[in-house]
């Protein structure tokens, strides 16, 4: 089976790398525009220059292209706690990230929110907080992990998963009480 190519890929595949086929004349291969620029006018003929113009402020192209317009720079999302790591340039989009001691949680492929790294109070750090993953905590005896926080076993209800984790502790307490009565 021959893989299906889109119109643009079909047109580009006829020309050598770094060139694209003229949209009005498929016998002409024009040189692509460098990153940071966009296509203003196709080359008039073989061996002649493509008219590329630099992207305007607030726009960019990150690779060689024959785009008629530059891409709009991304904005960091304040409502998601994002901060600007590096600003947009003509050849690179804005880079957004999180503050120190925060991690990114991706709600979808291109949407992340910044959250504070867990401190593992009443527990110990099993795995340190990373750029895209919260701290992994291990809880001290008498505590269980709920939504990445160590919660006292006194808050453990019978119906919850924590009963397995808290049961030895509860039995321990009962055992101590029993031994004290004899």
């Amino acid at each position: 089976l021959v893989p299906h190519l889109g119109d643009r890929e079909k047109r580009d595949s006829v020309c050598p790398q770094g060139k694209y086929i003229h949209p009005q004349n498929n016998s002409i291969c024009c040189t692509k525009c460098h990153k940071g620029t966009y296509l203003y006018n196709d080359c008039p003929g073989p061996g002649q220059d493509t008219d590329c113009r630099e992207c305007e402020s607030g726009s960019f192209t990150a690779s060689e292209n024959h785009l008629r317009h530059c891409l709009s720079c991304s904005k960091c999302r304040k409502e998601m706690g994002q901060v600007e790591i590096s600003s947009c340039t003509v050849d690179r989009d804005t880079v957004c990230g999180c503050r120190k001691n925060q991690y990114r949680h991706y709600w979808s492929e291109n949407l992340f929110q910044c959250f504070n790294c867990s401190l593992c109070l009443n527990g110990t750090v099993h795995l340190s907080c990373q750029e895209k993953q919260n701290t992994v905590c291990t809880c001290h005896a008498g505590f269980f992990l709920r939504e990445n926080e160590c919660v006292s076993c006194s808050n453990c209800k019978k119906s919850l998963e924590c009963t397995k984790l808290c049961l030895p502790q509860i039995e321990n307490v009962k055992g101590t009480e029993d031994s004290g009565t004899t």
Epitope: R77, K78, E79, M80, H105, W107, Q113, F115, N116, N134, E147, N148
Partner: nanobody
Framework: EVQLLESGGGLVQPGGSLRLSCAAS????????MVWVRQAPGKGLGWVSH????????YYADSVKGRFTISRDNSKNTLYLQMNSLRAEDTAVYYC????????????WGQGTLVTVSS
């Protein structure tokens, strides 16, 4: 007590429109960015759209961009989702929620409103 009541769902033909509403109470609505998420049959939760506190900054998933519009009326404590050019793949239960703050989980939910797109 936080309450979120979604409404406006229903059966609609492909290409049709619906307007979902979410009436909020029990918290200071105007202080919270708000989110629409959806759950298609047999699928996980998908982010649809969100809006900042004042209604200026919005975000849309690629799959709904140009077709859906999120808005809010802080005087009425209500969030909206205008859905146009509906497709079969938009069929889902739609939920509204305040944007999570402490961690990647939704602490408050409504009961959701079912949107079915079918001919």
């Amino acid at each position: 007590e936080v309450q979120l009541l979604e409404s406006g769902g229903g059966l609609v033909q492909p290409g049709g429109s619906l307007r979902l509403s979410c009436a909020a109470s029990g918290f200071t609505f105007a202080h919270e960015p708000m989110v629409w998420v959806r759950q298609a049959p047999g699928k996980g939760l998908g982010w649809v759209s969100h809006i900042d506190r004042v209604g200026q900054d919005t975000y849309y998933a690629d799959s709904v961009k140009g077709r859906f519009t999120i808005s809010r009326d802080n005087s009425k404590n209500t969030l909206y989702l205008q859905m146009n050019s509906l497709r079969a793949e938009d069929t889902a239960v739609y939920y509204c929620a305040p944007l999570p703050k402490r961690g990647p989980r939704f602490d408050y939910w409504g009961q959701g409103t079912l949107v079915t797109v079918s001919s």
